[in-house]
Interface confidence: low
């Protein structure tokens, strides 16, 4: 006969794993006991248990409790256990050793390896701001056993670097995503993605893009100047510009105070029916914690009287 | 016994994908990655990536970016090694590997030749 | 990427003799992290060494392994037969995987 076991069993921690040992032998031998011992403890072998197939299983006072029979059914010729809830300190190797009538006695030895899935972490970096240069985004963390892989999905262009800290049978693995910030950038998803054996799913953390910006700023309004003109009612300005954070907007006159009646809604300047007094030059100020910017434009509010005056004055002068 | 087997050899024109199957027996399949590694005639061992049978996650080597694919089948515990646009220097000898940290278990490999 | 260097490229001995391996990496590299393969014609890689120093199941006493940072090697106390064949180092704690290009041990 011959024992059937697996050269290597991997188990989750905190799970059970089921340590194989099968004897498959030829009609009428029987197995008489089996016993289980660590085979890579300091100290020469560690019993776990002693499975006797009369006196039934017999646990060592160091597995107390955390060694058991697979539910039946059992099959006799089967010498396979659970150790229940298995934690790093487990791996190693283990020795079943079958005694069998008539054939005598076989050994076989495998090897438990724990998997320990990650829990992944991710740490956004410092503010990003337009016009840096290669700026960290994010990190991501993980650590387990083996070591896991911690790699980025994202559509943003940016490179990455990894490095990881061995601990004993664990690693942790951090990978840095760095960019050069635009304003193209935000609101994009940064994903860190987390391979690991112990995990039924890569798993992902995903960091939202946050970068600082302010556009120039224009005004919108003075497109048709021949639009300003006395008496003209609902004339207004509009300053366009966008940023990260949304900026705030304010309007001056640079040539003295706004007239009265004159509204300041946000981005907008709204007029009164239009004098030759509100002609000047205004100042849109847009700024946010990133920056400021400013846009001035001239009104040139036009008076058809005086415009129609000096035509004459031109024709008689012709 | 842990097993990999992998298909057998295959000639390819310059131009042509080609898609290597990589059997796993013996263990548990999700419990392991499986890498890829090259040998050109001749030359040394070549490493070109893995995958995480579990999830599916993978991880490809620089140079084999864009060109390289890896898949599985947990149902039939196969994994799967697809090179895209082939040239001659493609031609070599393709491993798969099971990874305990280091490569404990290496199929028999795949000889790809790649010939107009 | 860390590069590994093999030196000799070729070692020729006779059974019986030592065989003394070297890798050396581009950077420091965990004594965890580093493997030696033996390849023979037509065959796949076979680890023999794992960890820098702990031996594979199946593999004889004879080989050994040895080493920590950058230096790196693998001892064959004494040349069986069986054993002229090419062996490779290898790293895998930092992506991509490397290997070093070979040390073929002939038969002199």
């Known amino acids: 006969g011959e024992l059937e076991t697996s050269d290597v069993v991997t188990v989750v921690l905190g799970q059970d794993a089921k340590l194989p040992c099968f004897y498959r032998g030829d009609s009428g031998e029987q197995v008489g006991q089996v016993a289980w011992a660590r085979a890579d403890a300091g100290e020469g072998a560690q019993e776990l248990a002693l499975l006797h197939s009369k006196y039934g299983l017999h646990v060592s006072p160091a597995y107390e409790g955390r060694v058991e029979q697979p539910p039946p059914p059992r099959n006799p010729l089967d010498g396979s256990v659970l150790l229940r809830n298995a934690v790093q300190a487990d791996e190693g190797e283990y020795e079943c050793r079958v005694s069998t009538f008539p054939a005598g006695s076989f050994q076989a030895r495998l090897r438990l390896r724990v998997l320990v899935p990650p829990l992944p972490s991710l740490n956004p970096g410092p503010a990003l701001e337009e016009g840096q240069g290669l700026t960290l985004a994010a990190s991501c963390t993980a650590e387990g056993s083996p070591a896991p892989s911690v790699t980025w999905d994202t559509e943003v262009k940016g490179t990455t670097s990894s490095r990881s800290f061995k601990h004993s049978r664990s690693a942790a693995v951090t990978s840095e995503f760095h960019l050069v910030p635009s304003r193209s950038m935000n609101g994009q998803p940064l994903t860190c993605v987390v391979s690991h054996p112990g995990l039924l799913q890569d798993q992902r953390i995903t960091h939202i893009l946050h970068v600082s910006f302010l556009a120039e700023a224009s005004v919108r309004g003075l497109e048709d100047q021949n639009l300003w003109h006395v008496g003209r009612e609902g004339a207004m300005l509009k300053c366009l510009s966008e940023g990260q954070p949304p900026p705030s907007y304010n309007w001056t006159r640079l040539d003295g105070p706004l007239p009265s009646g004159v509204r300041v809604d946000g981005d907008t300047l709204g007029f009164p029916p239009l004098t030759t007094e509100h002609s000047g030059i205004y100042v849109c100020h847009v700024s946010n914690e990133f920056s400021s910017r400013d846009s001035q434009v001239t009104v040139d509010v036009l008076d058809p009287q005086e415009d129609s005056g000096k035509q004459v004055d031109l024709v008689s002068a012709s | 016994q842990v097993q990999l087997v992998q298909s057998g050899a295959e000639v390819k024109k310059p131009g042509a994908s080609v898609k290597v199957s990589c059997k796993a027996s013996g263990y548990t399949f999700t419990g392991y990655y499986i890498h890829w590694v090259r040998q050109a005639p001749g030359q040394g061992l070549e490493w070109m990536g893995w995958?995480?049978?579990?999830?599916?996650?993978?991880n490809y080597a620089q140079k084999f970016q864009g060109r390289v694919t890896m898949t599985r089948d947990t149902s039939i515990s196969t994994a799967y090694m697809e090179l895209s646009r082939l040239r001659s220097d493609d031609t070599a000898v393709y491993y798969c590997a099971r990874e305990d940290w280091d490569f404990d278990y290496w199929g028999q490999g795949t000889l790809v030749t790649v010939s107009s | 990427e860390i590069v590994l260097t093999q030196s000799p490229g070729t070692l020729s001995l006779s059974p019986g003799e030592r065989a003394t391996l070297s890798c050396r990496t581009s950077?420091?590299?965990?004594?965890?992290?580093l493997a030696w393969y033996q390849q023979k014609p037509g065959q796949a890689p076979r680890l023999l060494i794992y960890g820098a120093s702990n031996r594979a199941t199946g593999i004889p006493d004879r080989f050994s392994g040895s080493g920590s940072g950058t230096d790196f090697t693998l001892t064959i106390s004494r040349l069986e037969p069986e054993d002229f064949a090419v062996y490779y180092c290898?790293?895998?704690?930092?992506?991509?995987?490397?290997f070093g290009q070979g040390t073929k041990v002939e038969i002199k």
């Open positions: 950077q420091s590299v965990s004594s965890s992290y």
């Open positions: 995958i995480n049978p579990n999830s599916g996650g993978t």
């Open positions: 290898q790293q895998y704690g930092s992506s991509p995987i490397t």
